[in-house]
Amino acid sequence: SYSMEHFRWGKPVGKKRRPVKVYPNGAEDESAEAFPLEF
């Protein structure tokens, strides 16, 4: 739930985190986001 989120100029502020992109193939222009596991 993002009920605690507040938006200003369309950007999330507060406690929503922004994961760092993963580039598993090194020199290739690909990124693999690590999606949270489903519990």
Epitope: K15, R17, V22, Y23, P24, G26
Partner: antibody, heavy 110, light 112 residues
Framework: QSVEESGGRLVTPGTPLTLTCTVS????????MIWVRQAPGKGLESIGI?????DTYYASWAKGRFTISQTSTTVDLKIISPTTEDTATYFC???????WGQGTLVTVSS | DVVMTQTPASVEAAVGGTVTIKCQAS??????LAWYQQKTGQPPKLLIY???TLASGVPSRFKGSGSGTEFTLTISDLECADAATYYC??????????????FGGGTEVVVK
């Protein structure tokens, strides 16, 4: 694709220093970049991140001590007022990946 | 900030043996966890991301597991080349109130 850090040198405490990470083979507008440092014989320490859209975030201990900025081909790390505790090898890293530079050594000593 | 606590600081095992390294996050990071290997004088090498996915070219002797706050790296069939320092890294990312990109203190693996 590669990154290369430069600008490390011997400085006296309190003398601002800017380190530069030059990237080749990719555009910074698409990628997240992290600055990491490693004091001699110690572990890795994350300083801060600049996201693909230019947003920057810093570790709590690094706020007010460092600033990160970027151009189209470089990411700069400014050490605002170095202390002897900032003596370390500084790395820039493309997100979570094997794209690390060899690092640049900063020595802070009077 | 997310704080990563890694244990043990050092571990010794024989060639062909197995070592287990644990990493604990101060808050849940889901599976946003990477493992790196660093040898003296070299930058770190990515081994595992998403807690359990092997990076390109990494042998299957390396296994990552865990989610939430508890993570484990297991190295089996140890080789001399595995002697290095291993680091866990959270990359859950950052918010205006907390920095989420942190490393564990490292574990030195000595192979006898």
């Amino acid at each position: 694709q590669s990154v290369e850090e430069s600008g490390g040198r011997l400085v006296t405490p309190g003398t601002p220093l800017t380190l530069t990470c030059t990237v080749s083979g990719f555009s910074l507008s698409k990628y997240d970049m992290i600055w990491v440092r490693q004091a001699p014989g110690k572990g890795l320490e994350s300083i801060g991140i600049i996201y693909d859209d230019g947003d920057t975030y810093y570790a709590s201990w690094a706020k007010g001590r460092f600033t990160i900025s970027q151009t189209s081909t470089t990411v700069d790390l400014k050490i605002i007022s170095p202390t002897t505790e900032d003596t370390a090898t500084y790395f820039c890293v493309k997100g979570v990946s094997n794209i690390w530079g060899q690092g640049t050594l900063v020595t802070v000593s009077s | 900030d997310v704080v990563m606590t890694q244990t043990p600081a050092s571990v010794e095992a024989a060639v062909g043996g197995t070592v287990t390294i644990k990493c604990q996050a101060s808050q849940s990071i889901s599976n946003y966890l990477a493992w790196y290997q660093q040898k003296t004088g070299q930058p770190p090498k990515l081994l595992i991301y998403s807690a359990s996915t092997l990076a390109s070219g990494v042998p299957s002797r390396f296994k990552g597991s865990g989610s939430g706050t508890e993570f484990t790296l297991t190295i089996s069939d140890l080789e001399c080349a595995d002697a290095a320092t291993y680091y866990c890294q959270s990359y859950e990312g950052s918010s205006s109130s907390s920095y989420g990109v942190g490393f564990g203190g490292g574990t030195e693996v000595v192979v006898k």
